[in-house]
Interface confidence: low
């Protein structure tokens, strides 16, 4: 979604004449009509597919047009669009003379046109104005234009919607390309994740707002890195919550019994904590990374199976690393991503895994589109059928049902009804606006001369000398039955008096 802006700057019509050459009386009260449409190699009349706008009368003959945007005026002219800017356009600017106050097209005489310019080309979205000047024999127009995105729309084609927000669902502003830019203290795809107090323990602490460090159960301290020992622990500490590991020389469940085996023998290795547990018995509580009765064995950090959801653990010098299976991510593979298992494809679309299942792509059936096959394709929106033809969606394609007298894929061809020789028996065919008409020869009738009409050949009394006339129905001709003493096809010759021939 965006706006095509046209800034009219100066119009020169020194002689104050119309396009026809006729002068305006008393001067050319000039207003403009603007038509913005899709790119045409040769700009032709037709629908202004991207929009139209008209100005009031801006001046007489030659004048400068002042920038009126600050006062809520109409210069620059605004032509909003609510689709992805295609990057190309055609523009028609007409200057008209307004004899009166009614500027509607039907109220103006046809020769009120002063000048008409048509340009076309490429235009990228941007803040910079393109200056242009068009000159004809009698007029000159100076103007500039640009395309900018509507509020909350971004990107090269004004197709990315981004609305800054600062609430439960995100804390961000929008970059010029439409990507999110998190507000200070927030992170994550939608900037919903607060950045906790620096040093706040990754596992044991969390926060609901920036620069906070709230401890999970069992942990305490400013950075949540101190465990809470078991309730009642007297002379002990903890390495994980609710533990009670006794100090040297103390024993018992709550380290409240004084024993000295650990103090005297120091049996625990590698910095382990020794707990006396009765006469000559002790327990070593090993530091992370060690095991064995006396904590003498080095332990792989992967032995505790820290990787979730089937992730595989790899030991490293400074700890371990989880290799996550498709569809999971995070330090311990604890987060899942959307995949084909989530049935993301609508309207019967089939899902295909990508990047070993890390993401997916939908293959849409005919008539549906969009990254999740959520949009229905309507191939009739552009009204492709000419001459009043009706557009029908037919599965993956479209077809035009033509009105009588028209044919062709888009009903663009006028059918000559006489082309298929519809008139029978030598009838003459005449094309009419709503069909055809047959002029029939003698002896035939009907819409297509298909009906044979019986002609009474004897009606004209063709037989002479009181001969009897008979009609031959098979040939629609007559036969004369002559009385005694006469011969000839019409009984016109007396017997014995031969006809006089010219030789």
């Amino acid at each position: 979604s965006g706006v095509f802006q046209l800034q009219l700057q100066e119009f020169i019509n020194e002689r104050g004449v119309l396009a026809s050459g006729r002068p305006c009386e008393p001067g050319c009260r000039t207003f403009f009509r603007v038509c913005l449409k899709h790119f045409q190699a040769v700009v032709s009349p037709g629908p202004c597919t991207f929009g139209t706008v008209s100005t009031p009368v801006l001046g007489t003959n030659s004048f400068a047009v002042r920038d009126d945007s600050s006062g809520g005026g109409r210069n620059p002219l605004q032509l909003p669009f609510n689709f992805t800017w295609p990057g190309t356009f055609s523009l028609i600017i007409e200057a008209w003379h307004a004899p009166g106050d009614d500027l509607r097209p039907e109220a103006l005489p046809p020769d009120a046109l002063i000048s008409k310019i048509a340009i076309q080309g490429s235009l990228a979205v941007g803040q910079n104005w393109l200056l242009d000047e068009q000159t004809s024999t009698l007029t000159r127009l100076r103007y500039s234009y640009r395309v900018i995105c509507s509020d909350n729309y971004y990107g090269d084609n004004c197709s990315r919607l981004c609305k800054k927000r600062n609430d439960h669902f995100g804390h961000y502003v929008c970059q010029p390309d439409g990507n999110l830019s998190c507000l200070p203290g927030w992170t994550g795809e939608y900037c919903q994740q607060p950045i906790c107090l620096s040093g706040c323990h990754e596992q044991n602490g969390y926060c609901s707002k920036p620069a906070e460090c709230l401890c999970r159960p069992g942990w305490q301290g400013r950075l949540c890195n101190e465990c809470i020992p078991h309730n009642g622990c007297r002379h002990g500490t903890c390495s994980t919550p609710w533990q009670c590991t006794c100090d040297e020389g103390w024993g018992g469940l709550f380290c409240d019994q004084d024993l000295n085996y650990c103090t005297h023998h120091s049996p625990c290795k590698n910095g382990a904590t020794c707990s006396n547990s009765g006469q000559r018995s002790y327990t070593c509580t090993c530091r992370p990374g060690y095991t064995g009765v006396d904590c003498e064995l080095e332990l792989s950090e992967c032995d505790s199976n820290p990787c979730r959801n089937g992730g595989s653990c790899k030991d490293q010098e400074d700890g371990y690393h989880c290799l996550c299976p498709p569809g999971y991510y995070g330090l311990h593979c604890e987060h899942s991503t959307l995949s084909c298992a989530d049935s993301p494809c609508f309207n019967g679309g089939s899902c295909r895994e990508r990047n070993q299942g890390a993401n997916y792509a939908c293959e849409c059936p005919p008539n549906f589109t969009g990254s999740n096959c959520e949009k229905k394709v309507d191939r009739c929106t552009s009204n492709p059928c000419a001459n009043g033809g009706q557009c029908l969606n037919r599965g993956p394609s479209r077809m035009c049902r033509c009105r009588p007298g028209f044919t062709g894929t888009y009903c663009e061809l006028h059918v000559s009804d006489c082309a298929r020789n519809p008139c029978a028996h030598g009838g003459t065919c005449h094309d009419l606006e709503n069909g055809l008409m047959c002029t029939c020869p003698a002896g035939f009738s009907g819409r297509r001369c298909e009906v044979r009409t019986s002609i009474d050949a004897c009606a004209s009394s063709p037989c002479f000398n009181r001969a009897t006339c008979y009609t031959d129905l098979s040939t629609d001709t007559f036969v004369c039955n002559c009385p005694y003493g006469f011969v000839g096809s019409r009984c016109e010759f007396p017997v014995g008096l031969p006809p006089s021939f010219p030789w």
Partner: nanobody, 120 residues
Framework: EVQLVESGGGLVQAGGSLRLSCAAS????????IGWFRQAPGKEPEGISC????????YYADSVKGRFTISRDNAKNTVYLQMNSLKPEDTAVYYC?????????????TGQGTQVTVSS
């Protein structure tokens, strides 16, 4: 504070119907998708249906397609799940959830759930 409250669960015989409701508060309801997932004892959660912010896009898991219908009433800040031809395997706790965005992608907030039991 974001709140999603489910209701309408209960005990029903196989072949019967139930209509679950999810009443939302604490956010701009018609800006966000709302969905339903369920969790049966000892099983992984299963996303069963979702409806986009506009209501123009819905999806259903294969296991409920043709039997369940999701709808929303933006004026009442409520989403409904009409469940017909119920089967014993539909027994679970049903949760209402929102991803916090307009499209059905992920889960950010969930309700406390409502129990649905289908007896044979």
């Amino acid at each position: 504070e974001v709140q999603l409250v489910e209701s309408g669960g209960g005990l029903v015989q196989a072949g019967g119907s139930l209509r679950l409701s999810c009443a939302a508060s604490g956010f701009t309801f018609d800006d966000y998708a709302i969905g339903w997932f369920r969790q049966a004892p000892g099983k992984e959660p299963e996303g069963i249906s979702c409806i986009s912010s506009s209501g123009g896009i819905t999806y259903y898991a294969d296991s409920v397609k043709g039997r369940f219908t999701i709808s929303r009433d933006n004026a009442k800040n409520t989403v409904y799940l009409q469940m017909n031809s119920l089967k014993p395997e539909d027994t679970a706790v049903y949760y209402c959830a929102t991803p916090g965005i307009a499209a059905c992608r992920g889960i950010h907030y969930t309700g406390q759930g409502t129990q649905v039991t289908v007896s044979s």
